[in-house]
Interface confidence: low
Amino acid sequence: KLTIESTPFNVAEGKEVLLLVHNLPQHLFGYSWYKGERVDGNRQIIGYVIGTQQATPGPAYSGREIIYPNASLLIQNIIQNDTGFYTLHVIKSDLVNEEATGQFRVYPELPKPSISSNNSKPVEDKDAVAFTCEPETQDATYLWWVNNQSLPVSPRLQLSNGNRTLTLFNVTRNDTASYKCETQNPVSARRSDSVILNVLYGPDAPTISPLNTSYRSGENLNLSCHAASNPPAQYSWFVNGTFQQSTQELFIPNITVNNSGSYTCQAHNSDTGLNRTTVTTITVYAEPPKPFITSNNSNPVEDEDAVALTCEPEIQNTTYLWWVNNQSLPVSPRLQLSNDNRTLTLLSVTRNDVGPYECGIQNELSVDHSDPVILNVLYGPDDPTISPSYTYYRPGVNLSLSCHAASNPPAQYSWLIDGNIQQHTQELFISNITEKNSGLYTCQANNSASGHSRTTVKTITVSAELPKPSISSNNSKPVEDKDAVAFTCEPEAQNTTYLWWVNGQSLPVSPRLQLSNGNRTLTLFNVTRNDARAYVCGIQNSVSANRSDPVTLDVLYGPDTPIISPPDSSYLSGANLNLSCHSASNPSPQYSWRINGIPQQHTQVLFIAKITPNNNGTYACFVSNLATGRNNSIVKSITVSASGTSPGLSA
C-alpha cells in the first residue's frame, strides 16, 4: 500500500523535511503533491510526468519544494505555515489513480529563557518569592532546577501558570540556592542562567568562644562572638550591662579578679532589623604561688638510705599531688605519703628511684606543678662486663678490650693481666698480639663514693689455629612437644664462620630449627623424639677450620599408649595367662596392672597360672614416666571359657 513518511515528523523552523514515499507502484504515468488531506487543484504544489521527466509547479508551490524521481518531496526553509497534511496523487499508466497522505508539525527554535523574581531579598520565615520563566512561549513545556537537581517535593514549593511560575512560600536560609528554568518543545530545549536566591535571615543566638569561663589572674581575656546572619551581623559587647565596644572580638589584657562578671554579646542584622544576645559568666581566680620540692638527702645510697621529699610552701586547706616519671604515684610498699600528702618518703632507695619527681598544688581552676627534681642515687659498681665477648684471637691482630660497670658516680677502672696491674683506664689496647699475650685479663671497677670494688676475669687465648670447638646446651633433658633446646658453639671468635651438622648431614630446612647469634646458636623449638641425634658444630676462618665432638640430644618422651601382648582375648580354663605391656618412653616407664579396677603388681609382665572363668574381666596396664610427669593406660577384656567350650572350636 502506498504510504508517506515524514522525516522528521517534528520540524524546527528554518530546517527541512523530507516526505518519503513507500511502496510506489510500477508503470507510472506521473504524480502530483497537494497541500492538505485531499486532491485540490487550487492547492497543488507540484506535478511530475515520468515520460518527459518534466516537473510543473502548482498554485501552492513556494519555490522551497524539490520533487525526486521516486516521488519523494523535500521542503526546505520550513516556516510555521508549513505545518499540516500533504497528499500524493499517483497516476498509473492504465490511468488508475492512487493517493496517500502524510503530515508533519513545525515548531519554533526556542530562545534562551531568563528568570524574573518578585522579591530579590526575601526575609526568612516571612516572605514568599515567585520566580517566572520568560518569555511565555506557545506549545512549550517549562521545567525548574534547584542546584542542578530537579525540584524537591515540598509543601512550600508550588508550580503555577503552566509550570511557568515557581513560588517558594515562607522562605528559609536553606532556600539560598541556584535556580534555573528550562523551556522545551519537540525540537529544542534551552536552560536559563542561574539565579541565586539571597534569603535574609538572623541573627541567630550568638555563640561566645572559647567556652572556658574560668581564668587566672594575669592572663589575657580574648572572647569572640559569632551569630549566623545574612547580611553578616554587627556585634556589640556589654560587661555587667555596660556597653564596651562594637567589635566581634573583645580583648582585655592582664585580667584581675575585678574582671569577673557577666559578658554579653549582642548581634544585630540591619536588613531584618532583629537583635539577639548571649551572656557568659567569667570568673577570674587569684594566682597561687608555684610549688617547689625540698629533699632531706640529696645523695642517697642505694639499698641503704631513705629520702623524704616535701612540697613547699605549706598552705592550709590545699590538696597536694605527686608524680613520678610523669605518672601518678605507683602502689609500692617503699612509697609513703604523709597525712596531708605534702611529704613523700622513699624507703630504701634504688637506682630506679631517680625520678623525676613533681609535686602539685590544686586550686579551683587547675593544678600548679613544681619544677621536676631528680634524685642522685649512689650505687654500684655492679659486676663489670668486658667486651667484646671473644675469647680467641689470632696473632698479629690488635687486642682492644673495654670494661663497663653500672655505677654512680661512674666507676674508676683498672686492668690486670695474670694478676699484674697494667693501667687505670676503661679500655685496654695491645697492638699486634702474639701467643705470649694469652692469659687471664681482669677488669676492676671501683666506686669512689661508696668505696666498693667489683672484678671480672676473662681468659684470652691467642693462637694461629682455631681450637676444637665444643657445644654447650641450655637443656640437657628436654621434654618432647614442650621444651626448646639452644645449642651454642664455643668459643666465640672473631671473623669466624659457624656451621652445624645433624647426624653428619647439613641442617635440614625446618621451621623448628633456627640459627642465631651469627649462626653460633642453634635452637630446636618443640623438640620431638626424632631430634635425639648427634649434633656437631664447626668453626672456620681464613686460616683454619675445626669440628666439635658430637653431642647427642636426650629427649624425654612418652609414655605412649601401651600395647598388651599377646593380642588374644579368649582363653581356655586351665591355661596360663601371661600378659606383657609395652610403651614407648624415655626413660623407661613404670608399669602397674589392675584387674577389674583392683591394683595388682608393679611389673611389666602379669602372670596368672591355671586361669578359670573367675579370671574373666578387664585387665588394665598403667604406665607412668616420672621424668615427663605423663601417664597413659590401656584396657583389655579377657574371657576364660570352661574346657572344651573354647569359642571358634567345634566337634
Partner: antibody, heavy 116, light 108 residues
Framework: DVQLVQSGGGLVQPGGSLRLSCAGS????????MSWLRQAPGKGLEWVAN????????NYVDSVKGRFTISRDNAQNSLYLQMSSLRAEDTAVYYC?????????WGQGTLLTVSP | EIVLTQSPGTLSLSPGERATLSCRAS???????LAWYQQRPGQAPRLLIY???SRATGVPDRFSGSGSGTDFTLTISRLEAEDFAMYHC?????????FGQGTMVDIK
C-alpha cells in the same frame, strides 16, 4: 709463615704405586684438617681426599676410593698420599693443602705421570 | 655431586678495567659456601674469597665476591698487571668438594 713442602712425584707405569709426602711448618698441623687436590694438564682443580686432626676421619673422591690412602704423622708435621693401581687418568699435578672447607695454604705441587 | 660452571672461559681485558667472573652451581649451595682462588702460571692456587663474599687475609680490596643460592660472582674493580691469571670457584657445601673449570683473565 705457613709452609707446605711436597715430595715424591715422578713417572709410574699403569697399575703401579707411589707415595706423595707433604711436610708442614709454621703452624700446628694437629689442629688442622689437611687435603690432597690435583690438576690434570690443561684442566681444572679436583679435590682428592682429606683427613681430620687426629686421623680418625678420612674422605675420598669416588674415582680414587679403594686405590688411594691418606694418612698423617702429627709428630713429624707430615701428610701422605699412598697411591696404588694407578691409571693414565691419574696423571696430574698433586697439591697438598690445609683446610677442611677452603684451602688457605698450598704446597708447591708435584707432578705424577702414569704412562707405559 | 654439585657441578660448577664458570663463564666466560676466557676474559680479555686491559689493566684498569673491571672484571666480572661468573660461577653457576647445578644445585643450591648451603650457607653461601663458595670460595674463589687465583692461580698464576706454574704456581699453586691462592685463596681469595670464602663464604661467597669474605676476603681472605692479605687479599686486596679490589677483589669482591657476591651471590647466593646457585649464582655467584667474583669482581675485580680495577685490573692490575699481577691480576692476569686463572680463577677457580669451589663449593664446600657438600662432599665431594668440587671446582669450576676455571676462567682465564688475560691481557687484551
Amino acid at each position: 709463615d705457613v709452609q707446605l713442602v711436597q715430595s715424591g712425584g715422578g713417572l709410574v707405569q699403569p697399575g703401579g704405586s707411589l707415595r706423595l709426602s707433604c711436610a708442614g711448618s709454621g703452624f700446628t698441623s694437629s689442629l688442622s684438617w689437611m687435603s690432597w687436590l690435583r690438576q690434570a694438564p690443561g684442566k681444572g682443580l679436583e679435590w682428592v681426599a682429606n683427613i681430620n686432626q687426629d686421623g680418625s676421619e678420612k674422605n675420598y673422591v669416588d674415582s680414587v676410593k679403594g686405590r688411594f690412602t691418606i694418612s698423617r704423622d702429627n709428630a713429624q708435621n707430615s701428610l701422605y698420599l699412598q697411591m696404588s693401581s694407578l691409571r693414565a687418568e691419574d696423571t696430574a699435578v698433586y697439591y697438598c693443602a690445609r683446610g677442611l672447607w677452603t684451602f688457605d695454604s698450598w704446597g708447591q705441587g708435584t707432578l705424577l705421570t702414569v704412562s707405559p | 655431586e654439585i657441578v660448577l660452571t664458570q663463564s666466560p672461559g676466557t676474559l680479555s681485558l686491559s689493566p684498569g678495567e673491571r672484571a666480572t667472573l661468573s660461577c653457576r652451581a647445578s644445585q643450591n649451595i648451603n650457607n653461601r659456601f663458595l670460595a674463589w682462588y687465583q692461580q698464576r702460571p706454574g704456581q699453586a692456587p691462592r685463596l681469595l674469597i670464602y663464604a661467597a663474599s669474605s676476603r681472605a687475609t692479605g687479599v686486596p680490596d679490589r677483589f669482591s665476591g657476591s651471590g647466593s643460592g646457585t649464582d655467584f660472582t667474583l669482581t675485580i674493580s680495577r685490573l692490575e698487571a699481577e691480576d692476569f691469571a686463572m680463577y677457580h670457584c669451589q663449593q664446600y657445601g657438600s662432599f665431594p668438594r668440587t671446582f669450576g673449570q676455571g676462567t682465564m683473565v688475560d691481557i687484551k
